[in-house]
């Protein structure tokens, strides 16, 4: 026997307690699916969340986040505050990042510059907060006569603060 | 009859999580959404979100997005709630308790005994 | 999120009286549901959808109202009955209940 509730489309749902007929979701509810027994509350996107779309009868709302603030988790399911380039998020808000860090976006977490000596590279540039070193070539690929300019001193070892 | 048993007292620390069960019977564990709230010592009761078993879709109070878990097995017909990052405030009682989605007036027609968490360092 | 405040928070009355909770809504509602909650007991389904008594609530309660202001009237009150009555909504998320309305019967 078919169950009588395979018949009920999307935005609507089985209404056990009316013989099973199939009902429209009520506001602020909806389904996505056909043969649904419930209507899901809709995704209300408030405080650092706002509305990306709207919910319908058919799907749900899509939240992202207010300015200063990203997104984090699956359908954005968190807002986390922005940092400025060269911060972290911490426990106790933005911080710098430590000397041979860097970050070069509002948000995630500060990283190690690269070690050009592990690649057999000199730095062309030093690093900041911001920005990564930038590895030049090799001493060997220099070629003789090239520009007499002294390179940069190589950058500490990543993550340790000067003595 | 039916039933929702939940698991039994639970003592945490601080910054410690807990997993709260509640298992279903006497209905058709996925015909209806089921739901999780607290009371604090002499307080009132706070809802913390649902779950619709058939789906898995979850709807929380914002207050609890990021610290409240709640999953199901059907298998099993029963469904959790995890609370993380404990603090001395998540000191209730955790009820689960069923709702009849169908009717959509989303009204808690059968509760659990409760479970009563403590966070005490 | 929608506030509920019932009034009065506290009610004494004797055997047979009328008593009357009221739950008022920060924002209009589409209707309320009431609990009744003994001491050391879960909340028991007592009204759905603003005046449907739940099986075996006696028929000396009623509930009635709409918009922002809602009701539970007890007939002719019960020893029975002294507990804590709370109302809820959903209309917008979150769910969210009253703080309560505790009745003491003399």
């Known amino acids: 026997l078919q169950d009588p509730c395979s018949n009920c489309p999307a935005g609507t749902f089985c209404d056990n307690n009316r013989n099973q007929i199939c009902s429209p979701c009520p506001p602020n509810s909806f389904s996505s699916a056909g043969g649904q027994r419930t209507c899901d509350i809709c995704r209300q996107c408030k405080g650092v969340f706002r509305t990306r779309k709207e919910c319908s009868s058919t799907s749900n709302a899509e939240c992202d986040c207010t300015p200063g603030f990203h997104c984090l988790g699956a359908g954005c399911s968190m807002c986390e505050q922005d940092c400025k380039q060269g911060q972290e998020l911490t426990k106790k808000g933005c911080k710098d990042c430590c000397f041979g860090t860097f970050n070069d976006q509002k948000r995630g977490i500060c990283r190690p510059w690269t070690n050009c000596s592990l690649d057999g590279k000199s730095v062309l540039v030093n690093g900041t907060k911001e920005r990564d070193v930038v590895c030049g070539p090799s001493p060997a690929d220099l070629s003789p006569g090239a520009s007499s300019v002294t390179p940069p001193a190589p950058a500490r070892e990543p993550g340790h603060s000067p003595q | 009859q039916v039933q929702l048993v939940q698991s039994g007292a639970e003592v945490k620390k601080p910054g410690a999580s807990v997993k709260v069960s509640c298992k279903a019977s006497?209905?058709?564990?996925?015909?209806?959404?089921m739901h999780w709230l607290r009371q604090a010592p002499g307080q009132g009761l706070e809802w913390i979100g649902y779950i619709n078993p058939s789906s898995g879709y979850t709807n929380y109070n914002q207050k609890f997005t990021d610290r409240a878990t709640l999953t199901a097995d059907t298998s099993t017909s029963t469904a959790y709630m995890e609370l993380s990052s404990l603090r001395s405030e998540d000191t209730a009682v955790y009820y689960c308790?069923?709702?009849?989605?169908?009717?959509?007036?989303?009204?808690?027609?059968?509760w659990g005994q409760g479970t009563t968490v403590t966070v005490s360092s | 999120e929608i506030v509920l405040t019932q009034s009065p928070d506290f009610q004494s009355a004797t055997p047979k009286e009328k008593v009357t909770i009221t739950c008022r809504a920060s924002?209009?509602?589409?209707?309320i549901h009431w609990y009744q909650q003994k001491p050391g007991s879960s909340p028991k389904a007592w009204i759905s959808?603003?005046?449907n008594l739940a099986s075996g609530v006696p028929s000396r309660f009623s509930g009635s109202g709409s918009g922002t202001s809602y009701t539970l009237t007890i007939n002719r009150v019960e020893a029975e009955d002294a507990a804590t009555y709370y109302c809820q909504q959903w209309s917008s998320n979150p769910f969210t209940f009253g703080q309560g309305t505790k009745l003491e019967i003399k």
């Open positions: 006497g209905y058709t564990f996925t015909f209806y959404t």
């Open positions: 308790a069923r709702s009849d989605g169908s009717s959509s007036k989303w009204y808690f027609d059968v």
């Open positions: 959808a603003t005046s």
């Open positions: 924002s209009s509602v589409s209707y």
